[in-house]
Amino acid sequence: ESLGTEQRVVGRAAEVPGPEPGQQEQLVFGSGDAVELSCPPPGGGPMGPTVWVKDGTGLVPSERVLVGPQRLQVLNASHEDSGAYSCRQRLTQRVLCHFSVRVTDAPSSGDDEDGEDEAEDTGVDTGAPYWTRPERMDKKLLAVPAANTVRFRCPAAGNPTPSISWLKNGREFRGEHRIGGIKLRHQQWSLVMESVVPSDRGNYTCVVENKFGSIRQTYTLDVLERSPHRPILQAGLPANQTAVLGSDVEFHCKVYSDAQPHIQWLKHVEVNGSKVGPDGTPYVTVLKTAGANTTDKELEVLSLHNVTFEDAGEYTCLAGNSIGFSHHSAWLVVLPAEEELVEADEAGSVYAG
């Protein structure tokens, strides 16, 4: 799988300038070479603290691995040093430079930095496996609703063409290990599991290898089981309102529900001077409820036209489904027409239960 990026053989201790962010440099070194990767700050500006990462894991400095803010040196390189390297901003984890490094059996020519190496050009160069799109392999955690399908991919290359195998929680993973089996596509470097269930949770590792080396990537799968819940009402809605006599007012209520919700708008009223009945239930009148041709969207808005002083008071958005009910309330204050409009002090939702 070609990236269309420059691929060249780099001589011993050659320093490789970093590619533009978002591009990927494919580099080949000989066994025993010093790998030097350089990642200057984008636009020449300040870089801030950085971290160097290989195959998704932060590199630990050692006598052989020399880590600087803009440069990485790996001395006496071997096959195990092949892989995907990136330089990232420490705080944001933003990738500043990508490199795909292959360390081949033979030492590199030492002089040739322009990609004119004959073995490389003729495609007979041997090399350990490497990820063809390492920047796509940064994400490691996949959370999937049960009953859906999962695909893990580890596209790689190498010469000879590497083989791919899969592990689950560190052990060989085969079709007979799960109900429904698995589907492997070696030419797509992929593992597919249909209709996942909670027992599919775990760590899945692809192991890509040829006689020159081996690389691996581990993904974590979480299978989500939904637990039904009563409707959720968006915080802050409906909001308290202050309106001038004769003006129009809208209250909004945003409802989230798995099960089909039933939405009602209620106005709190007094009966014989009391706001609540003997059992403590508020007295309300239903202003708006579902009809044959009303949509949920329409029910999420309560419109009051040409308001009077009688419209002042407490309004409640009540939403119910098969699991339970939720409600939020807000107040309407009506001012005389000649008064200046004053915002309600306690703007926002009054949560009622």
Epitope: V144, A146, R151, F152, V192, D258
Partner: antibody, heavy 127, light 107 residues
């Protein structure tokens, strides 16, 4: 056995409304999604929209956005297609289909596959 | 929108023939392509998903291949029940779009 049964089709005047139902059985309703696909007489298939039954999220084709609404009642295992402001070009057989996602970290989209379909219900918009 | 173009629009073949239908996307859709089969007056049926994965219960004479913009559905040995209209459909982009269909008729 997975089954989807549409109902609610019929003759309606331009500008009118209709609500189609899709009753599902044989699978865990809230785990996957329901798509609506239509087929005008003698024509090909056109995707109308989709809802994810777990989180209630919806997507619509531009041709129906603002006029059609997909919803679901998980207690009844039923999805709905509310069609308002109907036009002559909405005349078609409407199918609902169970829709599952193929989740893949390697790409930045979810592939959606419609694996079980209902028998379809005919909606005719005519004066 | 991503346009899906199938070819041919129709073809005539005999039982036992090998039949190939192609589908071209107006932009790269990776392997996010499904194939459906529809008989007159019936609902479509899923055959292939993700370009090359055979859906469960579908006979192995059906196979799919391709990635990017060019895809192929192959029926290795046409059977009487395979005479139908076949649609490809992509779902990388919004909205999901179908090809115009390929009608496979009896020669």
């Amino acid at each position: 056995e997975v089954q989807l049964v549409e109902s609610g089709g019929g003759l309606v005047q331009p500008g009118g409304s209709l609500r189609l139902s899709c009753a599902a059985s044989g699978f865990t309703f809230t785990s996957t999604g329901i798509s609506w696909v239509r087929q005008a007489p003698g024509k090909g298939l056109e995707w109308v929209g989709r809802t994810h039954l777990g989180d209630g999220s919806t997507n619509y084709a531009d041709s129906v956005k603002g006029r059609f609404t997909i919803s679901a009642d998980t207690s009844k295992n039923t999805a709905y297609l509310q069609m308002n402001s109907l036009r002559a070009e909405d005349t078609a057989v409407y199918y609902c289909a169970r829709t599952y996602g193929i989740y893949d970290l390697y790409v930045d989209y979810t592939e959606y596959v419609m694996d079980y379909w209902g028998q379809g219900t005919l909606v005719t918009v005519s004066s | 929108d991503i346009q899906m173009t199938q070819s041919p629009s129709s073809l005539s073949a005999s039982v036992g023939d090998r039949v190939t239908i192609t589908c071209r996307a107006s932009q790269d859709v990776d392997t996010s392509l499904a194939w459906y089969k529809q008989k007159p007056g019936k609902a479509p049926k899923l055959l292939i998903y993700s370009a090359s994965f055979l859906y469960s219960g579908v006979p192995s004479r059906f196979s799919g291949s391709g990635s990017g913009t060019d895809f192929t559905l192959t029926i290795s040995s046409l059977q009487p029940e395979d005479f139908a209209t076949y649609y490809c459909q992509q779902s990388t982009g919004h909205p999901q779009t179908f090809g115009q269909g390929t009608k496979v008729e009896i020669k």
